[in-house]
């Protein structure tokens, strides 16, 4: 053996955000050579499972036929080849939704928004939470936490904006966590469509998606700007 | 030391089900999968399936998938295998067998302990 | 599934006799091959994973070998206490399948 194993490849269909008691499936392609294939979870003393390879032996399934909080987690993946172990896969994080109760979500002073000036989305728990996610939908990078320091729990916080541009124009949803497991999300707030107004474009709705559906290449990151806000939650970009 | 102690001789009418259990001891339970083996009389080994006692995930030898329904109890580390509408093909001794991970760093796994075997009589 | 064929099915030996028992697989396992001692009382204990390990409290006159398809178990010096059937096995896909299994006697 000239080297170690390539690693194999893990993803989830149909996404790694799945809603409570939705189905999922967990895929790790590897090679033609594969014997088996072994999935292992995060913290889990065992591996997880393991299955014979699919034909033409390059990729294994591991079906999760209902969600639930036990299955949450951060996944990596190996295939047995007859000269041995793979490395192992990059992690795949399986996040589920519907953990606890929907969040709401509003625009101050208003969702119109004119071009260049300011908006704050405020994403407001009935519960006090330590995460909260704001999510843009078709956006490249659709994840921004604000989390609260030192363990400190709210029952809000705020996503300042400024100065919007046309950019910052679609359909947005927040959820809320617990510091305890980053996999496990509240139930999406409602929809809020953020219209920008005054651009040399006119703002293209976007139509509702679910949050696991990939991002396509075109579609800008959201960039909020400004301090971070006086509520204990501290900025992270994922 | 590690140990598996299986449940009681049964004997049982055509038709009907049992549930044989194995009490783990001597170990993390929820560390090693758990195997299930069966041997009739004067015969070789058949695998039936395993379970992992950590998520209940479980693989089946496609002979006993409509045969046999693997549990765990992680509280009280114990493994149980149902056996369902049994024929005299069903009389054979059942093991339990753990597996898992043999040496620090190896990646080679295989049934280590076994049980002592239930023995199971099926007839009317 | 694989098949493994054990040979022979059954051999007399004198204590103290050098003893191999034989297991080729259907394909290639790649050494994926455990061997089992099953005494007349049904206990079972692993001896040897993955061709040629020896399980730990395993005596080291039991030693293994063989890759590919061809794989053997040997007993350098035979004693009463390996008495027993022994059984092959092989862990290279699932389903894990047995060998028909080897009664070792006294002669």
């Known amino acids: 053996q000239a080297g170690p194993l390539p690693k194999p490849t893990l993803w989830a269909e149909p996404g790694s955000v799945i809603s409570w008691g939705n189905s999922v499936t967990i895929w790790c392609q590897g090679t033609l050579e594969a014997r088996e294939y072994r999935l292992d979870k995060e913290e889990s003393p065992a591996p997880w499972d393991r299955q014979n390879p699919l034909e033409p032996k390059n990729k294994a399934r591991f079906s999760i036929p209902s969600m639930t909080e036990d299955y949450a987690g951060r996944y990596r993946c190996y295939y047995r080849s007859p000269v041995g172990w793979s490395q192992p896969s990059d992690p795949l994080e399986l996040v589920m939704t519907g953990a606890y109760s929907k969040p709401t979500l509003s625009a101050l002073p208003s969702p119109l928004v004119t071009s260049g000036k300011s908006v704050t989305l405020l994403c407001q728990s009935r519960s006090p939470m330590d995460t909260f996610l704001l999510i843009k939908e078709r956006a490249a990078h659709p994840l921004l936490h604000l989390r609260s320091e030192h363990g400190a729990q709210q029952h809000q916080a705020e996503f300042p904006m400024s100065p919007v541009t046309s950019v910052h124009g679609g359909t947005y949803r927040c959820f809320s966590s617990h510091g305890f497991s980053h996999y496990l999300l509240s139930h999406p707030s409602d929809p809020l469509e953020l219209i920008v107004s005054g651009s040399l474009e006119d703002p293209r709705p976007s139509p509702t998606r679910s949050v696991s559906t990939a991002a396509g290449p075109e579609d800008q990151p959201l960039m909020p700007t400004g301090s971070v806000p006086h509520s204990g939650l501290r900025r992270h970009w994922e | 030391e590690v140990q598996l102690e299986q449940s009681g001789a049964e004997v049982v009418k055509p038709g009907a089900s049992v549930k044989l259990s194995c009490k783990a001891s001597g170990y993390t339970f929820i560390s090693y999968w758990m195997h299930w083996v069966k041997q009739r009389p004067g015969q070789g080994l058949e695998w039936i399936g395993e379970?992992?006692?950590?998520?209940?995930?479980?693989n089946y030898n496609e002979k006993f998938k409509s045969k046999a329904t693997l549990t765990v109890d992680k509280s009280s580390g114990t493994a149980y295998m149902q056996l369902s509408s049994l024929t005299s093909e069903d009389s054979a001794v059942y093991y339990c067998?753990?597996?898992?991970?043999?040496?620090?760093?190896?990646?080679?796994?295989?049934?280590?302990?076994w049980g002592q075997g239930t023995s199971v009589t099926v007839s009317s | 599934d694989i098949v493994l064929t054990q040979s022979p099915s059954s051999l007399s030996a004198s204590l103290g006799d050098r003893v191999t028992i034989s297991c080729r697989a259907s394909?290639?396992?790649?050494?994926?091959l455990n061997w089992y001692q099953q005494n007349p009382n049904g206990t079972v204990k692993l001896l040897i994973y993955?061709?040629?390990r020896l399980h730990s409290g395993v005596p080291s006159r039991f030693s293994g070998s063989g890759s590919g398809t061809d794989y053997s178990l040997t007993i350098s010096n035979l004693e009463q206490e390996d008495i027993a059937t022994y059984f092959c096995?092989?862990?290279?896909?699932?389903?894990?399948?047995f060998g028909g299994g080897t009664k070792l006697e006294i002669k």
């Open positions: 067998a753990r597996w898992g991970q043999l040496g620090l760093r190896e990646g080679y796994y295989a049934v280590d302990y």
């Open positions: 993955y061709t040629s």
């Open positions: 379970i992992n006692p950590t998520n209940g995930r479980t």
């Open positions: 096995q092989q862990g290279d896909t699932l389903p894990p399948t």
């Open positions: 394909q290639d396992i790649s050494n994926y």
